[in-house]
Amino acid sequence: YCSGSKLKGPELSLKGTQHVMQAGQTLFLKCRGEAAHSWSLPTTVSQEDKKLSVTRSACGRNNRQFCSTLTLNMAQANHTGLYSCRYLPKSTSKEKKMESAIYIFVSDAGSPFIEMHSDIPKLVHMTEGRELIIPCRVTSPNITVTLKKFPFDALTPDGQRIAWDSRRGFIIANATYKEIGLLTCEATVNGHLYQTSYLTHRQTNTILDVQISPPSPVRFLRGQTLVLNCTVTTDLNTRVQMSWNYPGKATKRASIRQRIDQSNPHSNVFHSVLKINNVESRDKGLYTCRVKSGSSFRTFNTSVHVYEKGFISVKHRKQQVQETIAGKRSHRLSMKVKAFPSPEVVWLKDGVPATEKSARYSVHGYSLIIKDVTAEDAGDYTILLGIKQSKLFRNLTATLIVNVKPQIYEKSVSSLPSPPLYPLGSRQVLTCTVYGIPQPTIKWLWHPCHYNHSKERNDFCFGSEESFILDSSSNIGNRIEGITQRMMVIEGTNKTVSTLVVADSRTPGSYSCKAFNKIGTVERDIRFYVTDVPNGFHVSLEKIPTEGEDLKLSCVVSKFLYRDITWILLRTVNNRTMHHSISKQKMATTQDYSITLNLVIKNVSLEDSGTYACRARNIYTGEEILRKTEVLVRDLEAPLLLQNLSDHEVSISGSTTLDCQARGVPAPQITWFKNNHKIQQEPGIILGPGNSTLFIERVTEEDEGVYRCRATNQKGVVESSAYLTVQGTSDKSNLE
């Protein structure tokens, strides 16, 4: 030290702005000044540290100056920092320099960083656009430090935006989102890598949501405890200040508790709970939760009502009688209720608790929800409201009518794949059993056939657009005997049975019964196809043919039920039935009700025997139907007389019969001869069936002679003859 003229300010023994020393050495630092002074040390150096000592003495010319010596034994790396000597306040004039400082680096190759955050990074708060310091200060000014952002970004000092200061760390002039993350300062000393980590944490003012529960309006009875919870959701880096405005704020009526919930890793939830015990009428009004975060400001209001005593008022929301429709997904029976506190709610259906009656009933608030409405849901519904503590009870009844769209029972029972056929001329009873609420009106209609005269088909009955409403005296289509309607209880419900009686089935078409009420309309179509063919399909054989004769088969089908009519021959080969088509079939002929297809096979032989089938396709089902007939062509057989003629006598004026029964295939033709002359039928001579008998009445003597019968067919001829003797000839007559 020089003891020259007056000092400009405190003077340190170590000159310059910084000084480097090795760890383990002792730091000696003297301060001389014109006034009393004190030492300011790095935060890492404790004033109570046994290694630290400060000795004060008078010094300088005439001991008029103040000196103090700071001694730090066995200096450590973390003792690195700013050491300053400062005049005590009011101890010197304002013109003087008040403080002198020096930055001491305590260099330690094993501790390049003053603070090591290797296990858990140190949190550093940052604000975008402001200066950010990553405080990885070093123990020696010549240590090279790099700054990395995890995982692999390097933040390189450019002397402007990012600068390195061995005393302060990395200084980022105006921080951006790019600096948010895990930042690591790295230094390699003597081949060893040292790292200290910092987690930059951006402070934001993002208020995501503000809510008050319970939701507004909030109702209380006098004397109850009012509790309101204001919940604020912010992003992870936001902190908020919460306050309440409320009617009793001036008298501090409420106690307010605050807490923070950080269980969500990506947001913060702040709670402010306002509580007033024994709420009074003066506490009613607007309660406002005010939330502030930096420049962000949000408020949320709720309205509080305080009632002296409980109350219930109940009215019909709609009319007392409500209507709904069966099949509806749900129906809500709802009453207009004003009540406090919330009453107990019970709904009755016809005097029985509704929810016990059916699982389809559920109570929501003051409403009864009926799911999947059915006719059984009709009835009287009563809402019972009760507040037991206030001994308050109210009830109100509403009537529910369940309307049902008309249903025709016969439509629901499985219908036949193809319509029935009605025999020509028959009396028919057509019935529709109808249910609906309100009771449906039933009408019968007649739809005449509309023929589609296309090449493909000219005999099918299409439903026509035109229709005629029928009554008991209608003669359109078919003569109507009558239309009747009667009520019947079927399966526990009132149903209307409507009957249409057709007196004489002649005209094909379709009848329909139409049932309608205010809910809707339903129609059942009854195709009325008249047939002149038993069962709508008939096969006949004219006669059993004999070899050489013609085979004649006939197939008649209902034209309303069948199409594609054809004859086929069935043959069995190796236990398999083969269908053989028959060529040279005639064209089918169409009549009023049927289609006829005749099959004629001329000059049949035994080989033509077999199973003949008429095949037709059902118009409705597409199914092929076969009707079979066995044809056995008979073999030719030569005639055979079953009994020969025998001579016999007959009295004159008597009568006689000659019998010539013959068998053969084909049936033989019988011819009679008398004395070789062919007998023709004439008065007195009668030929019986098939000429097999010869009857002579009032025999005369001319009738005597040789009678011969001849049986003939393609296979041969057979004859028999006999002599007829007439007794009492001219002798008798002469006697007369």
């Epitope: 296990d119 995890f150 995982p151 692999f152 970004d153 989102y177 948010i180 987690l199 890793p265 990506h266």
Partner: antibody
Framework: EVQLLESGGGLVQPGGSLRLSCEAS????????MNWVRQAPGKGLEWVAT????????SHAPAVKGRFTISRDNSKNTAYVQMNSLRAEDSAVYYC????????????WGRGTTVTVSS | QSVLTQPPSASGTPGQRVTISCSGS????????VYWYQQLPGTAPKLLIY???QRPSGVPDRFSGSKSGTSASLAISGLQSEDEADYYC???????????FGGGTKLTVLG
């Protein structure tokens, strides 16, 4: 709610290509690095690729280097991995993960999308 | 072959303490933070431990992590049946310039 949703997986023939997408919601996507990690059936987790917050630096696992490319579009809050020259051994569930929040580990994961490479 | 080494399986009865080890090298565990992940059957992994020993909010304090040199370990005390899962350790690897994982340890809760 913080969410990652992967898409683009499917069946592809060896030598074919696929592009997987990972859409982020509920956090500041542009601030954090994104990763793709895969898991073959019955096997452990295998890191595939990482991209920094700005999309300027990428790193790929040796097994996929030269065939796979990680990228991101911060305007769409979406990360991608383009997979070319696919092999049978690339068949796996591919997860997208991000290093959000304060942990800087993979603290948000998607549900995964399945990639099957088979002829 | 995983860069980090974990035992393939571990087991314990309810209430017991179980430790899972994870061993690496200077380029990964020694110079970087260790993370532990839990993967329940059929789900995506979930972060269990970060910065060697820190628990994210929502993770029970039965789970704890530690690191020493090139090794790390996960301890689960008061084992519960819902802890049955696969556990993976993970860290950044400076030489690979990427994440590395252990092969996973299947934890079975007996009884």
């Amino acid at each position: 709610e913080v969410q990652l949703l992967e898409s683009g997986g499917g069946l592809v023939q060896p030598g074919g290509s696929l592009r997987l997408s990972c859409e982020a919601s509920g956090f500041d996507f542009s601030t954090y690095a994104m990763n793709w990690v895969r898991q073959a059936p019955g096997k452990g987790l295998e890191w595939v690729a990482t991209i920094n917050s700005e999309g300027t630096i990428t790193s790929h696992a040796p097994a996929v280097k030269g065939r796979f490319t990680i990228s991101r579009d911060n305007s769409k809050n979406t990360a991608y991995v383009q997979m070319n020259s696919l092999r049978a051994e690339d068949s796996a569930v591919y997860y997208c993960s991000s290093t959000t929040g304060t942990t800087h580990g993979m603290d948000v994961w998607g549900r995964g999308t399945t990639v099957t490479v088979s002829s | 072959q995983s860069v980090l080494t974990q035992p393939p399986s571990a087991s314990g009865t309810p209430g017991q303490r179980v430790t899972i080890s994870c061993s690496g090298s200077s380029s990964n565990i020694q110079n970087n933070y260790v993370y532990w992940y839990q993967q329940l059957p059929g789900t995506a992994p979930k972060l269990l431990i970060y910065f060697n020993s820190q628990r994210p909010s929502g993770v029970p304090d039965r789970f704890s992590g530690s690191k020493s040199g090139t090794s790390a370990s996960l301890a689960i005390s008061g084992l519960q049946s819902e802890d049955e899962a696969d556990y993976y350790c993970g860290t950044w690897d400076d030489s690979l310039n990427g994440w590395v994982f252990g092969g996973g340890t299947k934890l079975t809760v007996l009884g």
